[in-house]
């Protein structure tokens, strides 16, 4: 349902995708129970949500991971929601951190991030984690989205 | 405040209710500081939020639980946000998992789930957990809601 | 972008600020990548978001903290989202609890709270924690905001 041609609803919800890439940027796909309202928001290269219109957006990500204290670095597992705007430095919008579990072989934990941010036309948001190999890709565990206010 | 008769605000926020039922589906009530905007969203049988209008909804749940690794099964505590639509499979929309704490008698942890989904008229959303007896029902700890974009 | 003069967008996102105060109420600032849509929502005394218009709001907070089981009280770390309305008792809207980590010197954990609530003109929301000294103020770790539906 549209708010009107001038002010259509803009929303996206994408699903995590396991990746063989060694990058810390999580990969996403339009599969399963995803949402992509229209072409005013797009998933680019499977890694970032890019918006065409300026405005305030509620942006969120959920990451479930499985890690073990002994098998991981001493540093906690950190998930970061980041912003890339044309001609600007990349910015960290939100971060969450969870210390690794002592459970074996690994202990699952879930992180949720969300906040309201002003995005410029062409701005992209993406999610970084300290160790993508620890992320859980089972149904519903890891997802990423936004909605325009 | 209404957006207009054709496009009223639709939102709900309900509060967890302890239940003697052995079902894994959490029970909710319109009590305390709850929200129920109008009859376009209803709480049915104390267990599911049902919407009358098709559209994009941001749906969320928060579950606080108290568990102990030794007293619980090896499997983590999992909270699932699920969708029931007429004539369709029930669907897992979102899940979060937390490994049980080693704290005694139990260690509290909180899970937050949220995402944007398209709902059909008559669709219902509900929350499943692996062990409802571990859920914390103190003021503000466990809640469930949605808002129509 | 405005919905119209009669119905402007109202949203805020503020950033945590370390404080020498011994109060359990977290302090916030309009700094970094913050949002303050207009004067219909304001940050008062660095501690509460106050709204001028009645209506339904999605209110959220994220708190990252670092604690150790041995160095902390036995009680878990609790974050509370609270409401203060003119001439009414303060109310707890949402709470989340996490048991302290056994990691040394401390283990980081993140809490996310969010829900839809009716606010009256002049209502304020604020965030309480059991031990503000444990809160992490690094970029993006701890934030607080709202948006009017």
């Amino acid at each position: 349902m549209q708010k009107g041609d001038q002010n259509p609803q803009i929303a996206a919800h994408v699903i995590s995708e396991a990746s063989s890439k060694t990058t810390s940027v999580l990969q996403w796909a339009e599969k399963g129970y995803y949402t992509m309202s229209n072409n005013l928001v797009t998933l680019e290269n499977g890694k970032q949500l890019t918006v065409k219109r300026q405005g305030l957006y509620y942006i969120y990500a959920q990451v479930t991971f499985c890690s073990n204290r002994e098998a991981s670095s001493q540093a906690p597992f950190i998930a970061s929601l980041c912003l890339k705007s044309p001609g600007r430095f990349e910015r960290i919008l939100l971060r969450a951190a969870n210390t690794h579990s002592s459970a074996k072989p690994c202990g699952q934990q879930s992180i949720h991030l969300g906040g309201v941010f002003e995005l410029q036309p062409g701005a992209s948001v993406f999610v970084n984690v300290t160790d993508p190999s620890q992320v859980s890709h089972g149904t519903g565990f890891t997802s990423f989205g936004l909605l325009k206010l | 405040m209404q957006k207009g008769d054709q496009n009223p605000q639709i939102a709900a926020h309900v509060i967890s209710e302890a239940s003697s039922k052995t079902t894994s589906v959490l029970q909710w009530a319109e009590k305390g500081y709850y929200t129920m905007s109008n009859n376009l969203v209803t709480l049915e049988n104390g267990k599911q939020l049902t919407v009358k209008r098709q559209g994009l909804y941001y749906i969320y749940a928060q579950v606080t639980f108290c568990s102990n690794r030794e007293a619980s099964s090896q499997a983590p505590f999992i909270a699932s946000l699920c969708l029931k639509s007429p004539g369709r499979f029930e669907r897992i929309l979102l899940r979060a998992a937390n490994t049980h704490s080693s704290a005694k008698p139990c260690g509290q942890q909180s899970i937050h789930l949220g995402g944007v989904f398209e709902l059909q008229p008559g669709a219902s959303v509900f929350v499943n957990v692996t062990d409802p007896s571990q859920v914390s029902h103190g003021t503000g700890f466990t809640s469930f809601g949605l808002l129509k974009l | 972008m405005q919905k119209g003069d009669q119905n402007p967008q109202i949203a805020a996102h503020v950033i945590s600020e370390a404080s020498s105060k011994t109060t359990s109420v977290l302090q916030w600032a309009e700094k970094g990548y913050y949002t303050m849509s207009n004067n219909l929502v304001t940050l008062e005394n660095g501690k509460q978001l106050t709204v001028k218009r009645q209506g339904l709001y999605y209110i959220y907070a994220q708190v990252t903290f670092c604690s150790n089981r041995e160095a902390s009280s036995q009680a878990p770390f609790i974050a509370s989202l609270c409401l203060k309305s003119p001439g009414r008792f303060e109310r707890i809207l949402l709470r989340a609890a996490n048991t302290h980590s056994s990691a040394k010197p401390c283990g980081q954990q993140s809490i996310h709270l969010g829900g839809v609530f009716e606010l009256q003109p002049g209502a304020s929301v604020f965030v309480n924690v059991t031990d503000p000294s444990q809160v992490s103020h690094g970029t993006g770790f701890t934030s607080f905001g709202l948006l009017k539906l």
């Epitope: 339009e30 399963g32 949402t35 309202s37 089972g138 149904t139 | 369709r88 499979f89 897992i92 398209e118 | -």
Partner: nanobody
């Protein structure tokens, strides 16, 4: 498109058990979830159980929780419904269905359906 063939239906006494099978062929790489519905005479088709192909997660209708178990053998491209403690009210035609990937929440994806298998619970 996915082709589905059910088997295992029949007549069983109250309290008895049956195991239904649903063999999939065709575009099996595009299966997101497989599950079961049933339709009793004069009633609407009713959801029973679903299993996610990706990780084996499952959901059940309240009416069968604790009595029915859905499972899948990916190597055989087959889903199963183990039905225990059967009751007369479980009598119906049981249909297997497959939901394809790419069926976003903004789309009502078309399911692929089997032809159905009759289960009769009677003494």
């Amino acid at each position: 498109e996915v082709q589905l063939v059910e088997s295992g239906g029949g007549l069983v006494q109250p309290g008895g058990s049956l195991r239904l099978s649903c063999a999939a062929s065709g575009s099996i790489d595009n299966i997101h979830a497989m599950g079961w519905f049933r339709q009793a005479p004069g009633k609407e088709r009713e959801f029973i159980a679903v299993i996610y192909w990706r990780d084996g997660s499952s959901l059940y209708a309240d009416s069968v929780k604790g009595r029915f178990t859905i499972s899948a053998d990916n190597s055989k491209n087959t889903a199963y419904l183990q039905m225990n403690s059967l009751k007369p009210e479980d009598t119906a035609v049981y249909y297997c269905a497959a939901e394809p990937y790419g069926s976003g929440s903004s789309l009502i994806s078309e399911y692929d359906w089997g032809q159905g298998t009759l289960v009769t619970v009677s003494s």
